[in-house]
Amino acid sequence: LADPLDHRDAGDLWFPGESESFEDAHVEHSISRSLLEGEIPFPPTS
């Protein structure tokens, strides 16, 4: 599946409890990014 969110900009993680982030880190924690970087959700059958 194509990645609808670009992954060139790596934002810092947010500090829980703060009212504001230092960066917008949603792209780094998006569904799209997980498809690029994560384990294969359904391994291919042999």
Partner: antibody, heavy 114, light 112 residues
Framework: EVQLVESGGGLVQPGGSLKLSCATS????????MHWVRQASGKGLEWIAH??????????YYAESVKGRFTISRDDSKTTIYLQMNSLKTEDTAVYYC?????WGQGTTVTVSS | DVVMTQSPLSLPVTPGEPASISCRSS???????????LYWYLQKPGQSPQLLIY???NLASGIPDRFSGSGSGTDFTLKISRVEAEDVGVYYC?????????FGPGTKLEIK
Amino acid sequence: EVQLVESGGGLVQPGGSLKLSCATSGFPFSNVWMHWVRQASGKGLEWIAHIKAKSDNYATYYAESVKGRFTISRDDSKTTIYLQMNSLKTEDTAVYYCTGLDYWGQGTTVTVSS
Amino acid sequence: DVVMTQSPLSLPVTPGEPASISCRSSRSLLTSKGITSLYWYLQKPGQSPQLLIYRMSNLASGIPDRFSGSGSGTDFTLKISRVEAEDVGVYYCAQFLVYPYTFGPGTKLEIK
């Protein structure tokens, strides 16, 4: 294929409770930040809750309109997020979407009425 | 809260003609790393919202390059170079930088 499927909506009386679920599939779930966004009929989008990942200690954030009444949670083993809604008000009537901000579910309708 | 405003709220467009929607935030959405946390969504009639543009100017996957996003820290524009019938719906801008996250009121694009 990425899927986000909300369920649990329905008709509830003011002051009542309801628990929404959002079952996800088709992507590695554990590191994804998830949200609930709602939309009253004919109105705009309102973000109401956000939950981060285990690596972020499952930090949660809420809109003032639902703080203290709604609770967002997640079960990584079931790749599902939840929205526990208590002390419901008529103004909570809306379609509730779960989203990763890039992908959205189809929504589930909550009606609060006596 | 960060207030997001949009104009116009209603936009009748002739197919094939360009269209432009403005969005303004009550505070800067530009981060120290040069990322601007401004997103555009389209909600077609009877459907869920779909992501068009993220971080102000990045086109989401599967979105035609007729769509483009631009702007500064507080003033943003979504442009459609040539409107097609399938573009009808409500366009929302949103910020995901400061809690609570907020959406604009929406711009309803309709075909003349």
